[in-house]
């Protein structure tokens, strides 16, 4: 098996990932591994010479680039935060800040926006991946309530009065909990949405 540099008449190389075709000399040369760049181009008698990327720069793939890419901070202005720092082999890994979703995507997320509030009586439908899309609010299922406007509040089960030795004064709704009262006590007319003990 030929070792780079080697002649190629059909302009293709055996290992597309780790080699590239150099049209000037009509040869296949080695690409540089991740974390490095081309410091000297190949010739018919000498293969590519690679050098390590300088601090705060990287190349992620086998490449024949003459420079490394500059590491970039995650940008809070775009609602992004860091999950892994930049290395010579990988760019800074960013994600949406909590309570936000990715609103613009170009190979990676470039802009996050605040999740919409879900109104009382609803909750955000759980997604497979956090931060991938805006909230889709769904009604609380039977026997549950949610009484705030919030992007993250979950529907809670209605209080079961009998579990506390109390009786139901007013049934729960999707937006409010059950109202309980002491079984010996009459319900005053001003009673609304509280628990009497």
């Amino acid at each position: 098996q030929a070792v780079p540099p080697y002649a190629s008449e059909n302009q293709t190389c055996r290992d597309q990932e780790k080699e590239y075709y150099e049209p000037q000399h009509r040869i296949c040369c080695s690409r540089c591994p991740p974390g490095t760049y081309v410091s000297a181009k190949c010739s018919r008698i000498r293969d590519t010479v690679c050098a390590t990327c300088a601090e705060n720069s990287y190349n992620e793939h086998w490449n024949y680039l003459t420079i490394c890419q500059l590491c970039r901070p995650c940008d809070p202005v775009m609602g992004l935060e860091e999950i892994a720092p930049c290395t010579s082999k990988r760019k800074t890994q960013c994600r949406c800040q909590p309570g936000m979703f990715c609103a613009a995507w170009a190979l990676e997320c470039t802009h996050c926006e605040l999740l919409s509030d879900c109104p009382p009586g609803t909750e955000a439908e759980l997604k497979d991946e956090v931060g991938k899309g805006n909230n889709h609010c769904v009604p609380c299922k039977a026997g549950h309530f949610q009484n705030t406007s919030s992007p993250s509040a979950r529907c809670q089960p209605h209080t079961r009065c009998e579990n506390q030795g109390l009786v139901e004064a007013a049934p729960g709704t999707a937006q409010s909990d059950t109202t309980c009262k002491n079984p010996l006590e009459p319900l005053p007319p001003e009673m609304s949405g509280t628990m009497l003990m």
Epitope: N56, R72, P73, D75, P76, G79, M100, C112, L114
Partner: antibody, heavy 120, light 106 residues
Framework: EVQLQQYGAELGKPGTSVKLSCKVS????????IHWVIQRPGKGLEWIGR????????ISTEKFKNKATLTADLSSNTAYMQLSQLKSDDTAIYFC?????????????WGQGTLVTVSS | DIQMTQSPSQLSASVGDRVTLSCKAS??????LNWYQQKLGEAPRLLIY???ILQTGIPSRFSGSGSGTDYTLTISSLQPEDAATYFC????????FGSGTKLEMK
């Protein structure tokens, strides 16, 4: 050590423009976003906007969209902010501050500020 | 837009006092908060980032706490050189500064 150099003072006439500079040493601005902050006399700090020096992309608050133009020059490691159509209430100190790979969420380094005085 | 409100706007205290400054966000900012100190004629200086992490070189008498919408900067034993204006800054969904608290010595 990261250092930011700004000129101390600029005088501008109403209706004209001034261009402020922020020269960074000790760090490649290609690894930063450069932010600009205004402080009017006796007042608080207000974020104006930021530039990505690698591609020139800028974001600024609505208030400064037609007032401040942000640019950067990687070769001289310098960021610029041009203030146009100067008015008396543009009289203020303007600070530059980078967010870096190690301080992406805070302004750990500041220029000393440029005092812009608008007067006829 | 998320608003940041600081209180009090002015405060007078004596050397050795324990001083507490407040910063309130108009909605949850998930502890994404910094504190800066600014003395007259100087650029601001980062004191605390991410709610409670002391910036390198800052005296340990400064501390930060809080969550959700309410945040606090505490100076455990006030020193004369602490006379300054203090600003909070959120970095959640962009940067916004609070209006500042001016701390004076009695």
């Amino acid at each position: 050590e990261v250092q930011l150099q700004q000129y101390g003072a600029e005088l501008g006439k109403p209706g004209t423009s001034v261009k402020l500079s922020c020269k960074v040493s000790g760090y490649n601005i290609g690894n930063t976003y450069i932010h600009w902050v205004i402080q009017r006399p006796g007042k608080g700090l207000e974020w104006i906007g930021r530039i990505d020096p690698t591609n020139g992309n800028t974001i600024s608050t609505e208030k400064f969209k037609n007032k401040a133009t942000l640019t950067a020059d990687l070769s001289s490691n310098t960021a610029y902010m041009q203030l146009s159509q100067l008015k008396s209430d543009d009289t203020a100190i303007y600070f530059c501050a980078p967010t870096t790979l190690t301080t992406p969420d805070s302004f750990a380094y500041w220029g000393q500020g440029t005092l812009v005085t608008v007067s006829s | 837009d998320i608003q940041m409100t600081q209180s009090p706007s002015q405060l007078s205290a004596s050397v050795g006092d324990r001083v507490t400054l407040s910063c309130k966000a108009s909605q949850n900012i998930y502890k994404y908060l910094n504190w800066y100190q600014q003395k007259l004629g100087e650029a601001p200086r980062l004191l605390i980032y991410s709610t409670n992490i002391l910036q390198t070189g800052i005296p340990s008498r400064f501390s930060g706490s809080g969550s959700g919408t309410d945040y606090t900067l505490t100076i455990s034993s006030l020193q004369p050189e602490d006379a300054a204006t203090y600003f909070c800054q959120k970095y959640y969904s962009g940067f916004t500064f609070g209006s500042g608290t001016k701390l004076e010595m009695k």
